[in-house]
């Protein structure tokens, strides 16, 4: 049978190295060898590249080598497949070398900021040695911040034949480390070089970018003072490398700037003790280059009525995220503050907060929260300087079975009845939302029975028991992940009720 007609011929000109063509099929049923017929020098010269019968038969690739690699030029390529049964030729394909030229990558030798020019990096590289001298090269510069996986790209061309080239990359973040890599190609070519080795550079430092500011209002103390826990952090979008030397805080009662108090701290939290009036609080961060813009917060008066506009809230889990969504009756509110912290019996150890704009949902990666921990999540509406009433919910990113079952006791044991009571499992041992409780009970040598009740029930009266019989019983608490049994208890129903026995005694 004749070999298959060679198709999908693809050629590439590795500048000053070789001109290589590949085709399909790559494997033939019977032994096949190939002859690649090339015309070059604009059609006035011709030669043949053969796949060697012994070593490279059935190998669908052939390379033409210097000195007959002419450039610029147009080549034609025709591949001929031959086996014992005959010859099959491909169609003739036409190749303009300028369009299929692949050159070596450039070499970046420096990525530096230029003194006094903000948010810019100057990239300097060496044009590849193996590249046509007079040709315009097109470049793709890829860059990303050092802690990001997302590359950004910028394309440009360079006509000069200087071996030493530069490009100024602007509109970057201040004081941020960037990774750069560069590739190039002759302007007309469809083939890019490989990427250069990556080089890192850092933009110049600036005065701090800004702060996000929040507070936790605590109950008033006996003497009427209100503790307010202020907290702040670098604003979203601030450079990763940004470091503040310190923070200035000043605050005063509304309409009374004469009573301004100031505090300087290097911490990112500070507790204020305020009176019952409305207060204004201002915080700036500073470094050796200056101050950040002012972050402002209004602390409402003790008796101020706060607005309420969140009507419902849901927390749901995706494969790797926790998503909280809420519904609001106030379309004008487009900023929200989200707080989250573990619901533990002790004081909140890790309190977190984040601002959300122009959205009514908030997302966090599951791996930022601990599995088997219950989190309290509160969302506050923020309208200009006013903070509304929060709406709260609880969520687990991963539920497990409880670490311990309920502690159970049998009360009011009767002839045919018993009342079982059990204690709630401590928060730290629940590992999920308790969905229900199941009471398992069994008479000595008898069949086991069970009864499931809602999670808000902590007591249950069992009836239709057998008199004067020993029972074993345990209560299982279940989450979505499964259940855990509590301690097993034993009790024996009475032979005669206390009430009946008492009556008999009096007669």
């Amino acid at each position: 049978v004749l070999p298959a007609k060679p198709e999908n011929i693809s050629c590439i000109f590795y500048y000053e190295e070789n001109f290589t063509c590949t085709w399909s099929p790559e494997k033939e049923a019977s032994y096949t060898w190939y002859k690649v017929k090339r015309t070059y020098s604009y059609g006035y010269k011709s030669d043949i590249c053969s796949t060697d019968n012994s070593t490279r038969g059935n190998h669908a690739s052939c390379s033409f080598l210097p000195p007959t690699i002419t450039n610029p030029d147009n080549y034609t390529i025709q591949v001929e497949a031959q086996n014992a049964d005959g010859i099959m030729k491909s169609d003739i394909t036409y190749w303009n070398l300028d369009a299929i030229m692949k050159i070596e990558p450039p070499e970046i030798f420096s990525v530096k900021s230029v003194l006094g020019i903000k948010r810019m990096l100057q990239i300097k590289w060496i044009r590849p040695v193996l590249a046509p001298h007079s040709s315009t090269l097109k470049y793709t510069l890829r860059f990303r911040t050092i802690n990001s996986a997302y590359w950004m790209e910028v394309n440009f061309t360079k006509e000069d034949i200087d071996r030493d080239e530069t490009y100024n990359l602007t509109e970057l973040q201040a004081f941020t480390e960037y990774v750069m890599t560069l590739r190039c190609a002759p302007a007309e070519s469809m083939f890019w070089s490989g990427w250069s080795q990556e080089k890192v550079g850092t933009t110049e430092e600036e005065a701090p970018y800004g702060l996000d500011l929040w507070r936790v209002l605590k109950p008033a103390m006996v003497d009427g003072r209100r503790p307010v826990q202020l907290m702040w952090k670098k604003a979203t979008g601030a450079p990763v490398l940004e470091k503040a030397l310190g923070y200035n805080i000043w605050y005063f009662p509304e309409n009374n700037t004469n009573l301004t108090e100031t505090v300087n701290t290097t911490n990112q939290t500070h507790e204020l003790y305020l009176g019952g009036k409305t207060y204004w609080v201002y915080v700036v961060s500073y470094n050796s280059l200056g101050e950040s813009p002012v972050a402002t917060l209004r602390i409402p008066a003790l008796n101020e009525k706060t607005f309420q506009c969140i009507e419902a809230m849901q927390a749901c889990l995706t494969q790797d995220q926790l998503v909280v969504e809420w519904q609001s009756s106030a379309p004008e509110v487009d900023t929200w503050m989200v707080e989250w912290f573990p619901d533990v019996d002790s004081e909140p150890s890790s309190f977190s907060w984040e601002s959300v704009s122009q959205a009514r949902n908030w997302t966090i990666q599951k791996d930022e929260l601990k599995p088997l921990w219950c989190y309290n999540i509160s969302v506050y509406p923020v309208l200009r300087d006013r903070v509304g009433q929060p709406y709260s919910t609880q969520a687990y990113v991963q539920e497990g079975i409880p670490s311990a079952g309920p502690v159970t006791q049998a009360d009011s044991i009767g002839v045919k009845t018993v009342t079982i009571t059990w204690k709630e499992i401590p928060k730290s041992k629940r590992n999920g939302f308790i969905k229900n409780y199941t009471i398992f009970y069994q008479a000595e040598d008898g069949k086991e029975f069970s009864k499931t009740v809602n999670s808000n029930i902590l007591q249950y009266r069992l009836e239709s028991l057998t008199r004067r019989t020993s029972y074993s019983l345990q209560v299982m608490a279940s989450t979505n992940a499964g259940g855990t049994n509590g301690t097993k208890i034993n009790f024996k129903t009475l032979s005669i009720s206390h009430h009946h026995h008492h009556h008999h005694h009096h007669h």
Epitope: T39, S41, Y42, G43, Y44, K45, S46, P67, T76, E80, G86, I87, K89, I92
Partner: antibody, heavy 119, light 107 residues
Framework: EVQLQQSVAELVRPGASVKLSCTAS????????MHWVKERPEQGLEWIGR????????KYAPKFQGKATITTDTSSNTAYLQLSSLTSEDTAIYYC????????????WGTGTTVTVSS | SIVMTQTPKFLLVSAGDRVTITCKAS??????VTWYQQKPGQSPKLLIY???NRYTGVPDRFTGSGYGTDFTFTISTVQAEDLAVYFC?????????FGSGTKLEIK
């Protein structure tokens, strides 16, 4: 205009040698192969061989190996065919030609040189 | 070397006749066959390349066909200006070889 100019005729004695010239205009011979073809009334056309003027590599039909030598002078854009040990069998018209491989044909022919071998 | 056997050697035809010339290669030359026309006192001119492709400007009464070893050249309606010698040539492998030619004469 692309042209190949050859001398009109050569009369040579048997056993002697002759060197035919072919001067190109309108193109650089280094970018082509220069071929030579023999024409005799009864035998038709016969390909003698070709040269790559860029590197001097030449290729001959087995029949003309030892009989013909093809050379070039790129500075004068000229190709040469030297025929040695001439006999009456070498009496013919000799054409230089440029071959266009994309459509497999001699696209430019020389004017032809008539060689007569006679005592 | 590949031998190209061309037949017939001579053809005497009238204007308007159909003419067929054949060329047989001593081994497969795939479709690497060219047909030339050589008019008296001129150098050869290309008519057909790759066995069946008509060259630019060549009238469509000239056609070619074949693959492997057997090739045919046809003039569908001979005209007075077609008086010439017609050659086949292979460039599948070196050395190039020509057929011995067919001389077409018009009655």
């Amino acid at each position: 205009e692309v042209q190949l100019q050859q001398s009109v005729a050569e009369l040579v004695r048997p056993g002697a040698s002759v060197k035919l010239s072919c001067t190109a205009s309108g193109f650089n011979i280094k970018n082509t192969y220069m071929h030579w073809v023999k024409e005799r009334p009864e035998q038709g056309l016969e390909w003698i061989g070709r040269i790559d003027p860029a590197n001097g590599n030449s290729k001959y039909a087995p029949k003309f190996q030892g009989k013909a030598t093809i050379t070039t002078d790129t500075s004068s854009n000229t190709a040469y065919l030297q025929l040695s040990s001439l006999t009456s069998e070498d009496t013919a018209i000799y054409y230089c030609a440029r071959y266009y491989y994309v459509s497999s044909h001699f696209d430019v022919w020389g004017t032809g040189t008539t060689v007569t071998v006679s005592s | 070397s590949i031998v190209m056997t061309q037949t017939p050697k001579f053809l005497l035809v009238s204007a308007g006749d159909r003419v067929t010339i054949t060329c047989k290669a001593s081994q497969s030359v795939t479709n690497d066959v060219t047909w030339y026309q050589q008019k008296p006192g001129q150098s050869p001119k290309l008519l057909i390349y790759y066995a069946s492709n008509r060259y630019t400007g060549v009238p469509d009464r000239f056609t070619g066909s074949g693959y492997g070893t057997d090739f045919t050249f046809t003039i569908s309606t001979v005209q007075a200006e077609d008086l010439a010698v017609y050659f086949c040539q292979q460039d599948y492998s070196s050395p190039f070889t020509f057929g011995s030619g067919t001389k077409l004469e018009i009655k």
